[in-house]
């Protein structure tokens, strides 16, 4: 199985300049137990919660969030109402944290592209990228060489193409520069976008005992499953100016369900320290 990824896209509504929508999605084989959307930074690290979405229990949202909803089984959207005249959302970072089993929690952040026109952001378009799986097979140097070669190949192919496939329509005054991003390849991300930063940390979840009402009850998601080590995965485009941070750790806050009687999955938030909160959906 490939490394899970989280994508974040922030859009300004063309019709209402004071309305913004944050779209987030999880690309991975696991079951999503909880999604937390925050602004001003990652959840639990200076960010303020805007919404918490549970796949079955419902959603909770707080101003300026207007409506949080599931768009698919692995993606959500959050509509925001900007009451201020100065439109503070334009310069704000929005973060989405997905708690999933068995991966743990993954978080990405993004913001409105600096000079984007209202309504310009197209929906995230999947593009093939080099999978993190290759790193284990070829080694880091092999991956980097392959990545560079792949980038050169893309650049050469782009030269011969008069109209780039990912460009918005010509009627827009500014075309978004889009880029793919592979979560475990910091060098590639830096090449693509100076704003992109990567923060990966892994902390395994340990399953004490199988829960009779646990993960099996949640449907698996229709995320792309690689066929083999060299299979490519679908990663949405991130508009220029996006800040990306993916963390393969485990929720110590909004991803956890408070303890309850009965067996379940134990989470160790930082691979040490006391037993974290437990709860069904991997966080009992």
């Amino acid at each position: 199985a490939g490394t899970p990824e989280v994508w974040v896209q922030v859009q300004m509504e063309a019709t209402e300049l004071s309305s913004f929508t944050v779209h987030c999605g999880f690309l991975g084989p696991g079951s999503i137990s909880l999604v937390t959307v925050s602004w001003g930074g990652p959840d639990g690290a200076g960010g303020t919660k805007l919404a918490v979405l549970h796949p079955e229990l419902g959603t909770r949202q707080w101003a300026p969030a207007r409506q949080a909803r599931w768009e698919t089984q692995s993606s959500i959207s959050l509509a925001l109402e900007d009451s201020g005249a100065s439109s503070p959302f334009a310069n704000t970072t929005f973060c989405c944290k997905f708690a999933s089993f068995p991966e743990g929690s993954w978080e990405s952040c993004g913001s409105l592209p600096p000079s984007s026109d209202p309504g310009l952001s197209a929906p995230p378009t999947p593009v093939p990228i080099l999978r993190a799986d290759l790193a284990g097979i070829l080694g880091l140097s092999g991956v980097l060489l392959f990545g560079c070669g792949y980038l050169l190949h893309l650049l050469r192919r782009q030269k011969h193409r008069p109209t780039p496939r990912l460009q918005p329509s010509h009627t827009n005054s500014q075309a978004l520069t889009a880029q793919a991003w592979a979560p475990s390849q910091a060098s590639q991300a830096a090449l693509h976008d100076p704003y992109a930063t990567i923060n990966t940390s892994f902390c395994p979840a340990t399953l004490d005992t199988a829960h009779p009402n646990g993960w099996a009850s949640l449907p698996t998601h229709a995320a792309h499953q690689p066929q083999g080590p060299a299979a490519s995965a679908s990663t949405p485009i991130l508009a220029r100016g996006s800040f990306v941070s993916v963390e393969n750790g485990l929720y110590t806050q909004a991803g956890e369900r408070p303890p309850h009687t009965g067996p379940g999955l134990t989470l160790f938030p930082d691979c040490r320290g006391p037993r974290a909160l437990e709860g069904r959906f991997g966080v009992r």
Epitope: L57, G58, W62, R69, W70, E71, Q73, E256
Partner: antibody
Framework: EVQLVQSGAEVKKPGSSVKVSCKAS????????IEWVRQAPGQGLEWIGE????????NYNEKFKGRVTFTADTSTNTAYMELSSLRSEDTAVYYC???????WGQGTLVTVSS | DIVMTQSPDSLAVSLGERATINCKSS????????????LAWYQQKPGQPPKLLIY???TRESGVPDRFSGSGSGTDFTLTISSLQAEDVAVYYC?????????FGQGTKLEIK
């Protein structure tokens, strides 16, 4: 084990205010909202509103807006609900709840009587 | 606000028999995005707070006996107790978990015949 422990019963005069507390333990207090629900004698359940501890973000049932105030103290893991301008019809058991109503306090009976 | 209407208001069923409680919402509780119905069922015994039984219309809460089951979609939902036990005597509430404000049905009182 998650526990929500509420303050004791109160008897209040019409026009006065009451402040009910709800002390949470067994989970990260700031992670989930504390919901407030009331139940008049022999009646059904009525959602009053919620507060997200930490950010103190709130949502109120329109019916109670202007009369109810939610606060939360993260240092003591305690949430508070204050209801003002009490009327006899506010006589009810007031519950705090968390995690989408999966966990509940034992309830606080507030009696409004002259 | 979404209005939740339960039927019947009260119900008397013999021990070991099936009990069925219906709940109708004034708006659909189905989220088309993930095809989930945001409806919960609670059991409340005298002098106690409500207890979550079912969420997502059909998912049983941990520790809830499997004689309790939930079904339905959109605006019509059902709570079924396949074989009534003495300890099931209580008031049962359905709840809209789809949109603000969370609203509850008026309750159905279940007794033993």
């Amino acid at each position: 084990e998650v526990q929500l422990v509420q303050s004791g019963a109160e008897v209040k005069k019409p026009g006065s205010s009451v402040k009910v507390s709800c002390k949470a333990s067994g989970y990260t207090f700031s992670s989930f909202s504390i919901e407030w629900v009331r139940q008049a004698p022999g009646q059904g359940l009525e959602w009053i509103g919620e507060i997200l501890p930490g950010s103190n973000s709130t949502n109120y049932n329109e019916k109670f807006k202007g009369r109810v105030t939610f606060t939360a103290d993260t240092s003591t893991n305690t949430a508070y609900m204050e209801l003002s301008s009490l009327r006899s019809e506010d006589t009810a058991v007031y519950y705090c709840s968390s995690y989408w109503f999966a966990y509940w306090g034992q309830g606080t009976l507030v009696t409004v009587s002259s | 606000d979404i209005v939740m209407t339960q039927s019947p208001d009260s119900l008397a069923v013999s021990l070991g028999e099936r009990a069925t409680i219906n709940c109708k919402s004034s708006q659909s509780l189905l989220n088309s995005g993930n095809q989930k119905n945001y409806l919960a069922w609670y059991q409340q015994k005298p002098g106690q707070p409500p207890k979550l039984l079912i969420y997502g219309a059909s998912t049983r809460e941990s520790g809830v006996p499997d004689r309790f089951s939930g079904s339905g979609s959109g605006t019509d939902f059902t709570l079924t107790i396949s074989s009534l036990q003495a300890e099931d005597v209580a008031v049962y509430y359905c709840q809209n978990a789809h949109s603000y404000p969370p609203t509850f049905g008026q309750g159905t009182k279940l007794e033993i015949k």
